[in-house]
């Protein structure tokens, strides 16, 4: 099939002991090969500080996956979710202030 770019959505969880869990979800993409990783100041976080979900079919002939990490509250601006898929790429910020989600469809 033809390439379908992912929809990328970044969300924050509640604060716990000064930390926030940030989750980056990529959905509705094809083919299934994708790079999804958290970066701090543009540098990829080490693997042992990130948790990945499996790349799974989402029932529409496309796929979905996610990556999560914990960051210190107040440092949200330093972090981005980096995505590479079928020659396209993008960086996605952690939502700041009262906004708790951000999504973007790649073209």
């Amino acid at each position: 099939g033809s390439t379908v770019p992912p929809m990328v959505n970044v969300t924050c969880s509640e604060v716990s002991e000064g930390n926030i869990t940030v989750t980056c979800r990529a959905s509705s993409f094809y083919p299934r090969n994708i790079t999804l990783t958290w970066r701090q100041d543009g540098v990829s976080l080490s693997h042992n500080t990130q948790q990945w979900g499996d790349v799974l079919p989402d029932g529409n002939g496309t796929y979905q996956t996610w990556v999560a990490t914990r960051i210190r509250q107040g440092e949200e601006q330093r972090f981005t979710c980096y995505m590479e898929h079928s020659g396209n790429h993008g960086t996605h910020p952690v939502p700041s202030g009262n906004s708790h989600h951000h999504h973007h469809h790649h073209h």
Epitope: G42, V43, R78, Y82, H89, G90, T91, P93
Partner: antibody, heavy 118, light 108 residues
């Protein structure tokens, strides 16, 4: 081959501004942050700030926040660093650098000497 | 701000000798955020070691890095003529990003 090519040396008067350019090649311009660092003659390295060319996010060293302006032109894949209200202590070599997969500065430009003198 | 203090300021050694450079941080740093750079006169710095102990691409195996917490070390097992340069440690864990003041390795 990844390269970052910077604009040429500048001589400026105190109180004026300077704008240094940095043109990377050999990779997708918007996939990595561009950092700026300066080095006064015979001194160490000082981080100025960085910009994410994809989303335009800028993080400054607070010491430079009021005088440095980082921008990118995605159409020409060029990054810029402008420093205003120049004083003699700003005389330095200014470097651009690319964020790496595992370190903050993995490739560097050749440097641009900015001399501030009356 | 995390202050990185490098010692000694200057290291005078002969080719073939072992060089040990220290970098001490004012606050604890995760090993993922400590990097080393080499700078020769008139040149830009170049990445030498990333994340405390990993050699950057093209860097010979005589260079090694170690450490944790607040104390980190760069070792050159046997100095080659091209190794005489200034070495900087850098931390990326906290803003502002900071560098040590450098250690100059000079020919004795």
């Amino acid at each position: 081959e990844i390269q970052l090519v910077q604009s040429g040396a500048e001589v400026k008067k105190p109180g004026s501004s300077v704008k240094v350019s940095c043109k990377p090649s050999g990779y997708a311009f918007t996939s990595n942050n561009i950092y700026w660092v300066r080095q006064a003659p015979g001194q160490g390295l000082e981080w100025i700030g960085y910009i994410d060319p994809y989303i335009g996010r800028i993080i400054y060293n607070q010491q430079f926040k009021d005088r440095a302006t980082l921008t990118v032109d995605k159409s020409t894949s060029t990054a810029y660093m402008e420093l205003s209200s120049l004083r003699s202590e700003d005389t330095a070599v200014y470097y651009c650098s690319r964020s790496g997969e595992r370190s903050n500065f993995d490739y560097w430009g050749q440097g641009t000497l900015v001399t501030v003198s009356s | 701000e995390i202050v990185l203090t490098q010692s000694p300021a200057t290291l005078s050694l002969s080719p073939g000798e072992r060089a040990t450079l220290s970098c001490s941080a004012s606050s604890s740093i995760s090993s993922n955020y400590l990097h080393w750079y080499q700078q020769k006169p008139g040149q830009a710095p170049r990445l030498l070691i990333y994340r405390t102990s990993n050699l950057a691409s093209g860097i010979p195996a005589r260079f090694s890095g170690s450490g944790s917490g607040t104390d980190f070390t760069l070792t050159i097992s046997s100095l080659e003529p091209e190794d005489f340069a200034v070495y900087y440690c850098q931390q990326g864990g906290s803003l502002p990003l900071t560098f040590g003041q450098g250690t100059k390795v000079e020919i004795k």
